[in-house]
């Protein structure tokens, strides 16, 4: 047994359309067949769950229909995309990975990705 390490980028800038993508990579100590990935947002010492998905290794990652997250998995790497972000959503987004099955259970928590969101300036009215 050894601890599970989770890596994610330190900083990501959301696009002008409010979309941010980052990779969450974990060093699996065991042969997990079922993995749960959760994105947590930490801002002003408050923690909220942004989204979560459980997937079987080799299968696609599926979030709930109303989730603001989408993602794909490849081996021990998860590509996460968060949409609909606004300036007020700027904060630290933490990737949490749990190896659910088979036992033993493993938990790994990344250091977080600081996502900066800048609301686009409204287009100036045209005089034409």
């Amino acid at each position: 047994c050894k601890a599970m390490h989770v890596a994610q980028p330190a900083v990501v800038l959301a696009s002008s359309r409010g979309i941010a993508s980052f990779v969450c990579e974990y060093a699996s100590p065991g042969k997990a067949t079922e993995v749960r990935v959760t994105v947590l947002r930490q801002a002003d010492s408050q923690v909220t769950e942004v989204c979560a998905a459980t997937y079987m290794m080799g299968n696609e990652l599926t979030f709930l229909d109303d989730s603001i997250c989408t993602g794909t998995s490849s081996g021990n790497q998860v590509n996460l995309t968060i949409q609909g972000l606004r300036a007020m959503d700027t904060g630290l987004y933490i990737c949490k990975v749990e190896l659910m099955y088979p036992p033993p259970y493993y938990l790994g928590i990344g250091n977080g990705t600081q996502i900066y969101v800048i609301d686009p300036e409204p287009c100036p009215d045209s005089d034409f």
Epitope: A3, M4, L40, A52, K96, M100, P104, Y105, L107, I109
Partner: antibody, heavy 118, light 108 residues
Framework: QVQLVESGGGVVQPGSSLRLSCAAS????????MHWVRQAPGKGLEWVAV????????HYADSVKGRFTTSRDNSKNTLHLQMNSLRAEDTAVYFC???????????WGQGTLVTVSS | EIVLTQSPGTLSLSPGERATLSCRAS???????LAWYQQKPGQAPRLLIY???SRATGIPDRFSGSGSGTDFTLTISRLEPEDFAVYYC?????????FGPGTKVDIK
Amino acid sequence: QVQLVESGGGVVQPGSSLRLSCAASGFTFSSHGMHWVRQAPGKGLEWVAVIWYDGSNKHYADSVKGRFTTSRDNSKNTLHLQMNSLRAEDTAVYFCARGGYFGCFDSWGQGTLVTVSS
Amino acid sequence: EIVLTQSPGTLSLSPGERATLSCRASQSVSSSCLAWYQQKPGQAPRLLIYGASSRATGIPDRFSGSGSGTDFTLTISRLEPEDFAVYYCQQYGISPFTFGPGTKVDIK
């Protein structure tokens, strides 16, 4: 605020069964793993079992494996621990605890005492 | 399973003094997955520190945690009367989740 209330403890004979319950309120129950931890009189804390999120995955301490079963009803915000083939060494205060977003046990119930004695 | 050892078993100190509690793991523990709890007689445990060094909500800043790998420390900078209790470390990164045997901090 988060509240966890255990019930179902009591005095039973060795070999018998008991079902503990934990009523949860003040948070989104299905978003958290739920744990059982016990404490024998005058002793330290011992983790007993966990049931994750939708209830499909459970893990147990070796000392209770095959005898104890945990379950949850997310529609009723309730956690259960079915204890069979009870032994004297199962005598303890049983706590339910919420697994926080970061995995630590961030909220605990007040505990319910189970005494196994002939 | 990961075995946690705490030392000393009992720490006798006076209010205002500094308390240093140690927790050692039998194998490396992710610092993200190490917690400290306080328990007073007849009460449930209370989370103090998670992730080795992050204070739980409402915990005074006289409590601090540090360490990595196999060695972790809980420090209480100036003991208040309400701090005399039993303190447990716990790892929650790998099942079975395990607690240390506890350190009792009592009044000298």
